[in-house]
Structure formats: structure tokens, C-alpha cells
């Protein structure tokens, strides 16, 4: 049992809405019929989360870009090696939420 | 656009079942009639995500704690510190899945 | 790693105006707020106002009201003190500084801008 | 305007001592305090909030008590690199810093 305290600061600075990392799961139906499994079944990315200080803001992405993975797809006979693209988040923002 | 590709072995490594830092909404009915608002209205610990090699797997905490963090009490007139006590998860594994 | 980079001194005139900055980086500029803080040597710590960039709410000292201006541009995470009608009563340090929502306690601060009014 | 009151202008200590600070609050702020510290020619350092939290990375020999009017800021053991301005901020309604800081000196 943890005896330390997290100050509430570094609770605040943690919680709030910045890029962080995500696991996604990965939808087979993308690859088409050919392929029985992706190796992993999920990735990770940056994404925007976390709480506003107001609850009329919400966290949202003001800038992002692709990123590119490589995933194994398990087809018989043979496995290949196949490219992904996934969107990612460098910077957030809270903005007042639209009506 | 991002031109460069993550190897597949960083893409299994880091999707793989551990610890990972999740955001967890609080609940204000946790806290009673008096309070008015919580802040941070979430907080972030570590527990397991990620996903295991095979469909028959789950990712399971095998190693968890308490932790204990302020949060801020807005209530009229005043506000207060409080503390609220959640699972964190240090280790994880993947088991077979529960029939 | 948190930083507010504040600009450097400013040397002006009586009656005139000037424009202090700061801009804030490692940090989701809209998630914390921006405070303004007087010091003048010998004389402790004045709060000027808070600044908030994620609905652009501010709060002024009524001592400062007419004599302070805050604004901020939230796509250079940069926030601004405009200081109107400078006398030597102005002549002072100013630092910039963030707070958590409701409780404003300073965890970082700008290394301070030097105003010297003098004609 | 709530005023907040620093007694003493100036403290002398030696190395190894305990020396305590106190600040008055000309009404009730509930526990809405935070100390900060601030040497020459440097921005000041969070020290304690919420009266009696200690700021990340501040050592254990600071801490600090008080509710209500009343507030005790404490640095025992004290070292030499804790010479400086010390000052009290109360933000239960609007903010505003004691006025005058407690200096303390060898």
C-alpha cells in the first residue's frame, strides 16, 4: 500500500489535455479477406486527452500528422509485412465546447 | 506528412500488454451534495492496456497498489483539499481468456 | 520541461505605452492560466491580473484595471502585459507566471522584465 | 482586499537551526496559503501550497501549517543556501502576497 501522497499540482499537470499515448485497436476488416491476423492487434499513437480546467471546454487536436507503422499480416500461405497509417496528435488545446 | 516508417519491432514492443498511463474521469457522486466541482475533473495511473499475441489471450494486472493523490474540493464558500485513493496497476500479464 | 520566456528590459518614457511578453512552452497552453505580477525593490509582490487562453476570461486588480492590458495569442502559446500611461511608480520588475484553474498557486515563473520610465 | 501580514521584516539564523515564519491573514482564507522563496536577482520558487503541501523537489526541512488567519512557514535544519526573501500569498479571494518580505539572514 502506497504511502506517499501525489501533490495535487502534479495531479493537476498530469490530468490535463496534452498528447498522449493511446492503444487503438486494429480492425482486420481494413486488410480485406486475405488476411487471418495482424501482428500486433493494436498499436500505440499520440493522441489528445485529458481533462479542461471548465466544463465548457473540451480537449481537442490543433495539430497533427500521419504516422506510419509496420504491421505482419498472417495470410497462408505465406506472412508479409505490410504498412499502416494512423493519425497522430502534437498539440492540443481546450476549446470552449460548439452548442 | 510523416516520411518515416516505425519498424515493426517498436510497433510490437510498444503495443504490447504493460502499464500505461490512462486517464480516469472522476465522479462527483463519490463525493456527496456539498461538493460543486472537482479539479482536475480526471486524473491520469498506470494500468494495463495493450494487446497479447494471441485472440485467446487477455492482458491482466498481476501487480497492483493504491495511490493516493489530492484533489481539489470547490464548495461554497470555501473549497478544500481532499484525498481519493485509486488502483494502479505495476505489473501485467496475459492469461487465457475466462471461458 | 515547463519554460516562460519573458522579453527583455525595457527603457521608455513617461506617458507612454509598452508591451511585455511571454510565451509559454512544454506545457498545453490552454490548461493553465497566465498571472502578471509587480515587484518593486523593497516593496514585496503585487497581482496584476490572470489571463485565461482557453475562453480568454481575465481578471484584473482594480488597482491595475486602468493602467494594465492582457491579451494572448494562443497559436505562439504567447500571452502579453500592455502597460498604458507610465509613470515612475511603474518602474518595476514584472513576471510572468501560470497557475491551475481556481487555485492560483505560481508553480513556474518568467525570469522577469525590467520597465524603467524616465524621461 | 485581504491583507496578509509578515511580522518580522528580518530573521537571523544560524546553519542547523529551526526558524519559523509567520503570516496573519486579515480574514478568514481557510487553507489557501502558499510560500514562496526568492533570492537576489532570481524569480521566486513555489514552496508550500494549500498551507501545508510541499511543492515537487522542495526538501523536507520546509513545511508549513496553518488554517484560518493564521500560518506558520518552518524550515528546520536550516542551510546556507536558504538564505533569502521568504513571502506568504493567500488566493482564497483574489490574490494578494504579504506585504514585505521576511528576509533571513546568517
Known amino acids: 500500500h502506497q504511502k506517499k501522497v501525489v501533490p495535487w499540482i502534479d495531479v493537476y499537470a498530469r490530468a490535463t489535455c496534452q498528447p498522449r499515448e493511446v492503444v487503438v485497436p486494429l480492425s482486420m476488416e481494413l486488410m480485406g479477406n486475405v488476411v487471418k491476423q495482424l501482428v500486433p492487434s493494436c498499436v500505440t499513437v499520440q493522441r489528445c486527452g485529458g481533462c479542461c480546467p471548465d466544463d465548457g471546454l473540451e480537449c481537442v487536436p490543433t495539430g497533427q500528422h500521419q504516422v506510419r507503422m509496420q504491421i505482419l499480416m498472417i495470410q497462408y500461405p505465406s506472412s508479409q509485412l505490410g504498412e499502416m497509417s494512423l493519425e497522430e496528435h502534437s498539440q492540443c488545446e481546450c476549446r470552449p465546447k460548439k452548442k | 506528412h510523416q516520411k518515416k516508417v516505425v519498424p515493426w519491432i517498436d510497433v510490437y514492443a510498444r503495443a504490447t500488454c504493460q502499464p500505461r498511463e490512462v486517464v480516469v474521469p472522476l465522479s462527483m457522486e463519490l463525493m456527496g451534495n456539498v461538493v460543486k466541482q472537482l479539479v482536475p475533473s480526471c486524473v491520469t495511473v498506470q494500468r494495463c492496456g495493450g494487446c497479447c499475441p494471441d485472440d485467446g489471450l487477455e492482458c491482466v494486472p498481476t501487480g497492483q497498489h493504491q495511490v493516493r493523490m489530492q484533489i481539489l474540493m470547490i464548495q461554497y464558500p470555501s473549497s478544500q483539499l481532499g484525498e481519493m485513493s485509486l488502483e494502479e496497476h505495476s505489473q501485467c500479464e496475459c492469461r487465457p481468456k475466462k471461458k | 520541461q515547463v519554460q516562460l520566456q519573458q522579453s527583455g528590459p525595457e527603457l521608455v518614457k513617461p506617458g507612454a505605452s509598452v508591451r511585455i511578453s511571454c510565451k509559454a512552452s512544454g506545457y498545453t497552453f490552454t490548461t493553465f492560466y497566465i498571472h502578471w505580477v509587480k515587484q518593486r525593490p523593497g516593496q514585496g509582490l503585487e497581482w496584476i491580473a490572470w489571463f485565461y487562453p482557453g475562453n480568454v476570461n481575465t481578471n484584473y486588480n482594480e488597482k491595475f484595471k486602468d493602467k494594465a492590458t492582457l491579451t494572448a495569442d494562443k497559436s505562439s502559446s504567447a500571452a502579453y502585459l500592455q502597460l498604458n500611461s507610465l509613470t515612475s511608480e511603474d518602474s518595476a520588475v514584472y513576471f510572468c507566471?501560470?497557475?491551475?484553474?481556481?487555485?492560483?498557486?505560481?508553480?513556474?515563473w518568467g525570469q522577469g522584465t525590467t520597465l524603467t520610465v524616465s524621461s | 482586499d485581504i491583507v496578509m501580514t509578515q511580522s518580522h521584516k528580518f530573521m537571523s539564523t544560524s546553519v542547523g537551526d529551526r526558524v519559523s515564519i509567520t503570516c496573519k491573514a486579515s480574514q478568514d482564507v481557510g487553507s489557501a496559503v502558499a510560500w514562496y522563496q526568492q533570492k537576489p536577482g532570481q524569480s521566486p520558487k513555489l514552496l508550500i501550497y494549500w498551507a501545508s503541501t510541499r511543492h515537487t523537489g522542495v526538501p523536507d526541512r520546509f513545511t508549513g501549517s496553518g488554517s484560518g488567519t493564521d500560518f506558520t512557514f518552518t524550515i528546520s535544519n536550516v542551510q546556507s543556501e536558504d538564505l533569502a526573501d521568504y513571502f506568504c500569498?493567500?488566493?482564497?479571494?483574489?490574490?494578494?502576497f504579504g506585504a514585505g518580505a521576511t528576509k533571513l539572514e546568517l
Open positions: 500569498q493567500q488566493y482564497s479571494s483574489s490574490l494578494t
Open positions: 507566471t501560470r497557475s491551475p484553474y481556481y487555485g492560483y498557486v505560481f508553480d513556474f
